[in-house]
């Protein structure tokens, strides 16, 4: 029944090529290279991938051939280090090439850039895309993998293969349709939005492993899988957690071939053992490999077993609590987390982890006390405020969302977060606050029992985006503190931040509030971003501005844009009315 008990292979590269097949092998090597060397041109990467593939084929033919016994890190690292323009393009990353494995790979990993200086992907006309697709389907799909991978250096590689398969299917279907655009554009929008969400979710997994360690990731996985598979026994959940941890450790570490191979094995194991895991897996397990793995990862929670006994008997009332804890601390805590999580699909994973941490802290203290039972007897009472805090926060914010709608709810969050951490760059504040604001439409529609896991676990993903972007250019001690102290308390830490009283308001710069006629041709989303950028800048200039003052200025701004976009001479309108707006805004805010 073991998944990862493979015999040693003479040639690792031949082993992976045979396991994955040529198409997946090439795609995964391309993703790996693009995630490491994010600035390299597409053609250079394709050349490197072809060279690696040809070499792999020689190893398949003869595993004893020269260099076939080398590790994948050695082979891939050597290949990356042949890039001629490494120092000019990547600066100090070129120093990685002077190191030996495993330090060289660690060095490449440290230079992955979450916010690379790359142009925004502009979608060509549908006819242009369809022509390119028909002219050279293989190159077209490789280009998709390359462009996504270099912009999302932690994208979950086997899942990117699934996205590419859907991308290909969309073009295959829609380029033959009568109305190509009506068919294709909604599909591409959906893939884009799902892709961004997938990237952000995986980024949190990698941050969890890299910044907080394997134990933190395993705890997250125990909680989530116990919610999803409440009928599975603890031993089964433990096994799945161990295997899943290996898969994500590999992908986050750049070992994409091993990761994809092991993910396929894990999906196979789950489907072979679905009777002992979950009744919801049947449909997933009938699908082809990429769809199957995706489906399992997204599968709905199974029904909870009937008549589960009270947790108190084994974890509070039993005289053996301290003995069982001392015997195997992590197993006992894992069992506590499993039992709590399978009973509470209505809690967020991070809340479950806070409860487990509180339980652990209590046992550490009480098992050393004179009367341990007396000491830990009320431990479940300590959970009440921890549960109520996210419940109340979600209730308040969903009420606000329902009252304001998404755009204005995002604006409320923009103001709130700019006041908390005004040192953070405006683009980051806009991006993060917009995403935080999406929690409303994503989660507030759910019934009470699904709101918390939807909202708080989504907020963890978004706040991790803030943390990784801030880590690249740290500007706020408060952000650093909330990001690094505790993974599960990030959201409560940010929620608890008040207005930063130490912040010195930004000097007023009229240029920041100067707009041109090009705003009129922007999409609604891009226009919103322009307005929200201005709102953040306003708050940075006047952090003590009231909601009413900011609302008045933003209303005036919206009216100004609408008026000038309807004017015959738009540019003149923006110039003249813009000056008036800036003056009126300064007066209104007392700038």
């Amino acid at each position: 029944r073991g998944v990862f008990r493979r015999d040693a292979h003479k040639s690792e590269v031949a082993h992976r090529f045979k396991d994955l097949g040529e198409e997946n092998f090439k795609a995964l090597v391309l993703i790996a290279f693009a995630q490491y060397l994010q600035q390299c041109p597409f053609e250079d990467h394709v050349k490197l991938v072809n060279e690696v593939t040809e070499f792999a084929k020689t190893c398949v033919a003869d595993e004893s051939a020269e260099n076939c016994d080398k590790s994948l890190h050695t082979l891939f690292g050597d290949k990356l280090c042949t890039v001629a323009t490494l120092r000019e393009t990547y600066g100090e990353m070129a120093d990685c090439c002077a190191k030996q494995e495993p330090e060289r790979n660690e060095c490449f990993l440290q230079h992955k850039d979450d916010n690379p200086n790359l142009p925004r992907l502009v979608r060509p006309e549908v006819d242009v895309m369809c022509t390119a697709f028909h002219d050279n389907e293989e190159t077209f799909l490789k280009k998709y993998l390359y462009e996504i991978a270099r912009r999302h250096p932690y994208f979950y590689a086997p899942e990117l293969l699934f996205f590419a398969k859907r991308y290909k299917a969309a073009f295959t279907e829609c380029c033959q349709a009568a109305d190509k655009a009506a068919c294709l554009l909604p599909k591409l929008d959906e893939l884009r939005d799902e892709g961004k969400a997938s990237s952000a979710k995986q980024r949190l997994k990698c941050a969890s492993l890299q910044k907080f360690g394997e134990r933190a990731f395993k705890a997250w996985a125990v909680a989530r899988l116990s919610q999803r598979f409440p009928k599975a026994e603890f031993a089964e959940v433990s096994k799945l957690v161990t295997d899943l941890t290996k898969v994500h450790t590999e992908c986050c570490h750049g070992d994409l071939l091993e990761c994809a191979d092991d993910r396929a094995d894990l999906a196979k194991y789950i489907c072979e053992n679905q009777d002992s895991i979950s009744s919801k897996l049947k449909e997933c397990c009938e699908k082809p490999l990429l769809e199957k793995s995706h489906c399992i990862a997204e599968v709905e929670n199974d029904e909870m077993p009937a008549d589960l006994p009270s947790l108190a008997a084994d974890f509070v009332e039993s005289k053996d609590v301290c003995k069982n804890y001392a015997e195997a601390k992590d197993v006992f805590l894992g069992m506590f987390l499993y039992e709590y999580a399978r009973r509470h699909p209505d809690y967020s994973v991070v809340l479950l982890l806070r409860l487990a941490k509180t339980y652990e802290t209590t046992l550490e203290k009480c098992c050393a006390a004179a009367d341990p039972h007396e000491c830990y007897a009320k431990v479940f009472d300590e959970f009440k405020p921890l549960v109520e805090e996210p419940q109340n926060l979600i209730k308040q914010n969903c009420e606000l969302f329902e009252q304001l709608g998404e755009y204005k709810f995002q604006n409320a969050l923009l103001v709130r977060y700019t006041k908390k951490v005004p040192q953070v760059s405006t683009p980051t504040l806009v991006e993060v606050s917009r995403n935080l604001g999406k929690v409303g439409s994503k989660c507030c529609k759910h019934p009470e029992a699904k709101r918390m896991p939807c909202a708080e676990d989504y907020l963890s993903v978004v706040l991790n985006q803030l943390c990784v972007l801030h880590e690249k250019t740290p500007v706020s001690d408060r952000v650093t503190k909330c990001c690094t102290e505790s993974l599960v308390n990030r959201r409560p830490c940010f929620s608890a931040l008040e207005v930063d009283e130490t912040y010195v308001p930004k000097e007023f710069n009229a240029e920041t509030f100067t707009f041109h006629a090009d705003i009129c041709t922007l999409s609604e989303k891009e226009r919103q971003i322009k307005k929200q950028t201005a709102l953040v800048e306003l708050v940075k200039h006047k952090p003590k501005a009231t909601k009413e003052q900011l609302k008045a200025v933003m209303d005036d701004f919206a009216a100004f844009v609408e008026k000038c976009c309807k004017a015959d001479d738009k540019e003149t309108c923006f110039a003249e009315e813009g000056k008036k707006l800036v003056a009126a805004s300064q007066a209104a805010l007392g700038l």
Epitope: G2, E233, A235, L240, N324, A328, G334
Partner: nanobody, 118 residues
Framework: EVQLLESGGGLVQPGGSLRLSCTAS????????MGWVRQAPGKGLEWVSW????????YYADSVKGRFTISRDNSKNTLYLQMNSLRAEDTAVYYC???????????WGQGTLVTVSS
């Protein structure tokens, strides 16, 4: 401290039956997957069968399916293995094992020898 004590082994003719028992102490028996592992002379360890903590799900190696039945009594902290239609290839030391992980067992007993021979 965890203790697993097997009993019920012995010499039996091909086609015969035996019932192995394993009495557990030192841990909360009802929390853990329990199983039987065997080691034939000169061979490695092999999972024979395991049972979920609540007894609702069982697994059997292909070589024993339809002949062996695993069961447990959580009120008595005891695990059983009913072995019918025994064959010469079932000859082995049978160990009772405690597992917190589907791929691993963390404790096992001293073992009881089952010899199937005419």
């Amino acid at each position: 401290e965890v203790q697993l004590l097997e009993s019920g082994g012995g010499l039996v003719q091909p086609g015969g039956s035996l019932r192995l028992s394993c009495t557990a102490s030192g841990f909360t028996f009802r929390h853990y997957r329990m199983g039987w592992v065997r080691q034939a002379p000169g061979k490695g360890l092999e999972w024979v069968s395991w049972i979920r903590p609540d007894g609702t799900f069982t697994y059997y190696a292909d070589s024993v399916k339809g002949r062996f039945t695993i069961s447990r009594d959580n009120s008595k902290n005891t695990l059983y293995l009913q072995m019918n239609s025994l064959r010469a290839e079932d000859t082995a030391v049978y160990y009772c094992a405690k597992s917190y992980h589907a791929d691993k067992f963390d404790y096992w007993g001293q073992g009881t020898l089952v010899t199937v021979s005419s």
